[in-house]
Every structure is written in structure tokens, then in C-alpha cells.
């Protein structure tokens, strides 16, 4: 059986996020069975975690991971040195910044230590799998008597996100959304003074600076106004 | 919060030098691509110099005339500016980019994605 496999992910690029190829083989054998696919997410440019389903394995396997960077100065077969754990079998590897060249392609290949034609390679385009940390030090301020300006902080370099802001009301079933640009401010201009608003954020690797599809986590809400004291509508209230 | 504050900018007559700072908060510039655009009256924004992965890229027209620097322990960047003439004359902005981007990836830039520059005026 000679099989070779190149699949692209599909992750919203003209070229794809990774590829996979798993070397050929010449007989029906353990080393025929796929190799788990590698999931990358680089978090906040801080470090990167490449994990795999070890469960997929038909026998509990350690599984190895080397990578490096094709066509760069980087481009010597490293050796994972961190790896996670899942029910003490290896589950992933993690990566520190400076391991991290986000605008080189990373070529990541997994491999059984006891079948060593058992292996899969794949090529990510690190910048489209970048994930902020959640956005920070939200805050309200009345621009006029019905209109408020949400504010709030990123750990990253600002013109490298875009937001989304949602907002609802206590009366309201469903979110209201916003998409924001890397400006990071969104102003409401009509505001209920009965009523009492929570407000929300997120935040993305897109467009200036990669193009990646995942949201951070939802920021810690914050709330305005008073669902309570009927005699000032007014009367406002921070939340973190 | 991420913030670069320049500082350093003033007139000047042609000939003369200046020193632009910025002073970086929030991240380390030591990680980062960090280097200087500038915008001059009715001009698009224009790169004058970046640090990219090892390599430093300056624009044509300011070649062995302005040299960028960095002191990490400060997280401050500079930009020297000798021999500066009229056309130099622009709001200079400090700029940083995730690590690596302006060498291989880099595309154009706003000014406005940045801080609020500082200005640079050089009279005949």
C-alpha cells in the first residue's frame, strides 16, 4: 500500500493553514494507521500549545513531536522540550516565544518512536492560529445624557485586532453585536436610563496582522445603569 | 495597557540633527519589530526605518543620514536624524510590529495605527 495524503485545513486562506502528509508505506501494518492531526493555537504571542487526541491511539502511544521552520534561518529539526500530558501519555507540546516565529512556516511532525515510518507532517501558517488574551479594564463614560463610550485594554498591539462588542439589556433575550476595529471603542448613542445594560468583548488576530478565525474569550462583563432606583435613572454602576 | 509615547520632535534649520524617543508600555520591544514611519503635509504615510528579525530596513531617502537604535533595558527606541532637510518635514510616528512581520510578511501601514508622532519641521 503506497498512500500519500494532502489534505489542506481549510482555515479561510487562500492558501491552506497546514498541510498533512503521512510518509508511504509498504505493507498493511500499525504503520498504515493515521497519525492523530495536530492542532496549533498560539496564545498571545506568548507561547504556543500543539496538542493531539492521544486517545485516538488503538494503544496507549507516546507519541513524539519534532518541528522547525522551512526556507528560514530556523529551519534545524527541533525537538519538543515541554511536552503536555494526558493520562501520562503525551497529548502535546508547548513551545515559549522565543521558539515562535509567527511569520515563517512551521512544519510540525509527529512520529511513533516504535515505528519510525509512522509519522505525519503538517505546515502552519502560525499568524492565521494566533489568540489573544481576552480584552481588559473595560469602562463606561457617559459621552451625553443617552449616550455611553465602552473603552478597554489588550495585552496585544492594538492595530493587530479587531473586536467584537455585545450588549444586552435585562429586558432583552439575545445579545446585540458590533464589530469593532483596532481603534477599541464603541459608543451606544441611544441609552435607556430605566434600563440596566452588560456589555461584553472579544477579540481577534485579523486583518492587519494575520488572519486568524478564532476569538479570544469573552472579556469579565460590565454593567450600566440601575434596574433598581426608579428616582435617579442615572445612577450608574462599574462593574469588572 | 500597549502604548508608544514618541517624544524628541522640533524645529530645526536644515543641516541640523534631532533625536526622536519612544518609550514603549504594555509589551517589550526587545520581542517585537519597532521601528519609525512618518506622514508629511498631504503625503501618504511612508516607512523611514524598521528592525526586523535581525535585519534593519531604512527608505531610500534617509540612507546613512538617520540610524534607529534601541535600548531594551529602557524599552526605548530611537531615531537619529542628521543632516536633515526640508523634506524630511513630517509628523514622525514610532511603530512596532509582531516579531519578524516587516520581513517576511510586511504590507503597508497607516500612521494612525500607531501613537500620536511627534513633529519634525526643517526650514531652509
Known amino acids: 500500500l503506497n498512500t500519500t495524503i494532502l489534505t489542506p485545513n481549510g482555515n479561510e486562506d487562500t492558501t491552506a493553514d497546514f498541510f498533512l502528509t503521512t510518509m508511504p508505506t509498504d505493507s498493511l501494518s500499525v504503520s498504515t494507521l493515521p497519525l492523530p492531526e495536530v492542532q496549533c493555537f498560539v496564545f498571545n504571542v506568548e507561547y504556543m500549545n500543539c496538542t493531539w487526541n492521544s486517545s485516538s491511539e488503538p494503544q496507549p502511544t507516546n507519541l513524539t513531536l519534532h518541528y522547525w521552520y522551512k526556507n528560514s534561518d530556523n529551519d534545524k529539526v527541533q525537538k519538543c522540550s515541554h511536552y503536555l500530558f494526558s493520562e501520562e501519555i503525551t497529548s502535546g507540546c508547548q513551545l515559549q516565544k522565543k521558539e515562535i516565529h509567527l511569520y515563517q512556516t512551521f512544519v510540525v511532525q509527529l512520529q511513533d518512536p516504535r515505528e519510525p515510518r509512522r509519522q505525519a507532517t503538517q505546515m502552519l501558517k502560525l499568524q492565521n492560529l494566533v489568540i489573544p488574551w481576552a480584552p481588559e479594564n473595560l469602562t463606561l463614560h457617559k459621552l451625553s445624557e443617552s449616550q455611553l463610550e465602552l473603552n478597554w485594554n489588550n495585552r496585544f498591539l492594538n492595530h493587530c485586532l479587531e473586536h467584537l462588542v455585545q450588549y444586552r439589556t435585562d429586558w432583552d433575550h439575545s445579545w446585540t453585536e458590533q464589530s469593532v476595529d483596532y481603534r477599541h471603542k464603541f459608543s451606544l448613542p441611544s441609552v435607556d436610563g430605566q434600563k440596566r445594560y452588560t456589555f461584553r468583548v472579544r477579540s481577534r488576530f485579523n486583518p492587519l496582522c494575520g488572519s486568524a478565525q478564532h476569538w479570544s474569550e469573552w472579556s469579565h462583563p460590565i454593567h450600566w445603569g440601575s434596574n433598581t432606583s426608579k428616582e435617579n435613572p442615572f445612577l450608574f454602576a462599574l462593574e469588572a | 495597557q500597549v502604548q508608544l509615547q514618541e517624544s524628541g520632535g522640533g524645529s530645526v534649520q536644515a543641516g541640523g540633527s534631532l533625536k526622536l524617543s519612544c518609550t514603549v508600555s504594555?509589551?517589550?520591544?526587545?520581542?517585537?519589530?519597532m521601528g519609525w514611519y512618518r506622514q508629511g503635509p498631504g503625503n501618504e504615510c511612508e516607512l523611514v526605518t524598521i528592525s526586523s528579525d535581525g535585519s534593519t530596513y531604512y527608505a531610500d531617502s534617509v540612507k546613512g543620514r538617520f540610524t534607529i537604535s534601541q535600548d531594551n533595558a529602557k524599552n526605548t527606541v530611537y531615531l537619529q536624524m542628521n543632516s536633515l532637510k526640508p523634506e524630511d518635514t513630517a509628523v514622525y510616528y514610532c511603530?512596532?510590529?509582531?516579531?519578524?512581520?516587516?520581513?517576511?510578511?510586511?504590507?503597508?501601514?497607516?500612521?494612525?495605527?500607531w501613537g500620536q508622532g511627534t513633529q519634525v519641521t526643517v526650514s531652509s
Open positions: 511603530a512596532a510590529e509582531p516579531r519578524g512581520y516587516y520581513s517576511n510578511y510586511g504590507g503597508r501601514r497607516e500612521c494612525n495605527y
Open positions: 504594555g509589551f517589550t520591544a526587545d520581542d517585537s519589530d
